[in-house]
Interface confidence: medium
């Protein structure tokens, strides 16, 4: 067993590790979410720029200093283009999120065009249809019971929009949608210990060809892709959606990661690689937005004054646009966008951010030199709740995102989508589908706490992403009954 004196020898301060678990006992035993553990570690050494920690038995560096973060994520990005997640590239492993730097470059170049303004405008009507169906469903349910568990409810909306926008699938029946959701839920919630194994023995999963994804999930995405490829006769259909792009890549046969097209760094587009991209788009498109919207609704229930301001803004904008929600009106709603940003400050979904050094690297402003292959971690949650950057950080306050307030803050003090070249490719899609749905909800309902609303909401320890423990229960009151 490796000894825990790695950081001591290098004069890097950090918390005392425990045998076997290092500093991650609570997350390894699923008592706390990894993001929460990282936030706690961040808070232990408020004066340090970097903290030496152990993920199980592997030494890693938790970076606190925002200038250092800027170097890692932006200025010295070429050293940190890898996320450092090592497992089998088979079975969904070569997806855009988990891919190594070279694979990511090859794929990222191709997928960035999916999220241009033009493409998002085209997708908007599909999102709109999904949002209308969702509101109809909520209205019908409301007649029976005004209390909802909004996290799992909103997953039905985001599942519809990602299925329609990315794959051209229409889930006609709620039953089909729920079946798909139940399968995809497994990837987010089944406690796989493969990640911990990788922390103890980096590269082992890759060597043993082990995946971190359940077989049932792999099979679901394989049949999903097979069906769509068959429906479109293996050729792009002209919808210009994610699947068309995938089919174009399939016809190409390979993509290269550099602009000169040297085959030394090309990636063969196998059906397995296609499945992996379908998987990451599905997961990233549905779970993150559903969780963000659920947390936003929770905060609006607890902060009626803010909700009133938002409802006034929604009503005003809709009145000026004949009651229609358009791509442009969503962007126009300044206070709504600020409330969304504040939600992501309080509930950054992907925690922690992770990068791997591709060579030895001296941490700027310190004497610390990290070795090649060292994992570097950043805790958005730690930063977002740091009173140094945000006054009264536990208070939901959209005004923090007034332009002048944002201008006063360090650019790395807000990291819900990561930063730099390898930030979240779908952040504009996520914002659009979320704000459209929230607009529709607020135009029809007022959100209030129910008798079962948890005022002390905890983070679910079993999920890989940040999410509400036990869901979020609130009442949706039709506004015609309120006014």
């Amino acid at each position: 067993m490796r000894t825990f004196n790695y950081w001591k020898k290098r004069n890097v301060r950090g918390p005392e590790p425990v045998v076997f678990f290092g500093n991650l006992k609570d997350s390894a035993l699923r008592k706390k979410n990894m993001g929460v553990v990282m936030e706690e570690l961040y808070n232990m050494f408020p004066e340090e720029k970097v903290i030496g920690i152990y993920r199980m038995t592997s030494p890693c560096l938790l970076v606190r200093d925002l200038d250092v973060i800027k170097h890692i994520m932006i200025k010295d990005f070429e050293v940190f283009s890898d996320r450092g997640v090592e497992f089998s590239k088979e079975g969904l492993g070569s997806n855009l999120f988990h891919a190594d730097g070279e694979t990511w470059r090859a794929l990222g170049n191709r997928f960035t065009p999916i999220f241009t303004s033009g493409k998002l405008k085209n997708m908007f009507y599909l999102m709109h249809e999904g949002a209308d169906n969702f509101i109809d469903h909520v209205s019908a349910e409301c007649e029976k019971n005004q209390e909802f568990e909004v996290h799992s409810l909103l997953q039905t909306y985001t599942m519809s929009t990602i299925a329609a926008c990315a794959f051209g699938i229409s889930y006609d029946s709620i039953g089909d949608k729920v079946k798909a959701l139940d399968i995809v839920d497994k990837i987010i919630s089944e406690p796989s210990y493969a990640i911990e194994l990788d922390m103890m023995y980096p590269g082992l999963l890759s060597k043993l060809n082990l995946s971190i994804f359940p077989t049932v999930v792999k099979n679901f995405f394989k049949s999903l892709v097979d069906n769509i490829v068959a429906q479109r006769n293996g050729k792009p259909s002209g919808r210009n959606d994610f699947m068309d792009l995938i089919l174009e890549l399939r016809q190409l046969g390979e993509v290269t990661s550099n602009k000169y097209g040297s085959s030394a760094s090309s990636l063969e587009i196998t059906d397995e690689v296609i499945c992996a991209q379908a998987f990451v788009f599905y997961i990233a498109g549905y779970e993150t937005s559903a969780t963000t919207m659920a947390y936003m609704i929770y905060q609006l229930a607890l902060n009626p004054d803010i909700q009133n301001k938002l409802i006034a803004e929604v009503d005003e904008v809709l009145k000026a646009n004949d009651g229609k929600v358009t791509y442009d009106t969503v962007k126009e709603m300044k206070y709504l966008n600020k409330a969304f940003d504040e939600t992501l400050r309080m509930y950054s979904i992907v925690e922690p951010l992770q990068r791997k050094a591709t060579r030895d690297y001296k941490i700027p402003g310190t004497d610390v030199v990290i070795e090649k292959d060292t994992i570097v971690l950043i805790s958005p949650r730690g930063i977002h709740y740091d009173p140094k950057y945000y006054d009264n950080p536990k208070q939901f306050n959209p005004d923090r995102f007034d332009a002048e307030e944002v201008g006063k803050r360090h650019p790395c003090a807000y990291l819900p989508f990561g930063l730099g070249q390898r930030n979240c490719i779908g952040m504009r899609f996520g914002r659009l589908q979320s704000l459209l749905c929230i607009t529709k909800i607020l135009s029809k309902f007022r959100i209030e706490p129910s008798k079962n609303t948890d005022r002390n909401l905890q983070v679910e320890p079993h999920r890989g992403l940040i999410g509400p423990k036990g869901g979020i229960r609130v009442n949706a009151i039709p506004r015609k009954l309120v006014s």
């Epitope: 799992s152 409810l153 909103l154 039905t156 139940d182 869901g471």
Partner: nanobody, 119 residues
Framework: QVQLQESGGGLVQAGGSLRLSCAAS????????MGWFRQAPGKERELVAD????????YYSDSVKGRFTISRDNAKNTVYLEIDSLKPGDTAVYYC????????????WGQGTQVTVSS
């Protein structure tokens, strides 16, 4: 239709513990989550705990946190409720119920099982 059958109730001394079971049959794929409710004499029926089949997401009401544990066995289509440190105030009829995703309208109900705690 989803059929639900509770079992495990009975007379217990204060401080003791009990494990209630709820077996689901029929079109269980329609059910996203199962909840345990209780109704004490002369009181409203209250939700005490809820668990989702697919992702194991668990909810407890504040009144029972720490003493009640809900769990599921997907292979057996059964949900359990373990109650520790029973108090006379836990005396009630305990019902299990099933709900769809996102709603808190429990649409299928069991017959209930009586739990009596004697001091």
């Amino acid at each position: 239709q989803v059929q639900l059958q509770e079992s495990g109730g009975g007379l217990v001394q204060a401080g003791g513990s009990l494990r209630l079971s709820c077996a689901a049959s029929g079109r269980t794929s329609r059910s996203y989550a199962m909840g345990w409710f209780r109704q004490a004499p002369g009181k409203e029926r209250e939700l005490v705990a809820d668990i989702a089949w697919s992702d194991g997401r668990i909810y407890y009401s504040d009144s029972v946190k720490g003493r009640f544990t809900i769990s599921r066995d997907n292979a057996k289509n059964t949900v359990y409720l373990e109650i520790d440190s029973l108090k006379p105030g836990d005396t009630a009829v305990y019902y299990c119920a099933s709900r769809a995703r996102g709603t808190v309208s429990y649409n299928y109900w069991g017959q209930g099982t009586q739990v009596t705690v004697s001091s």
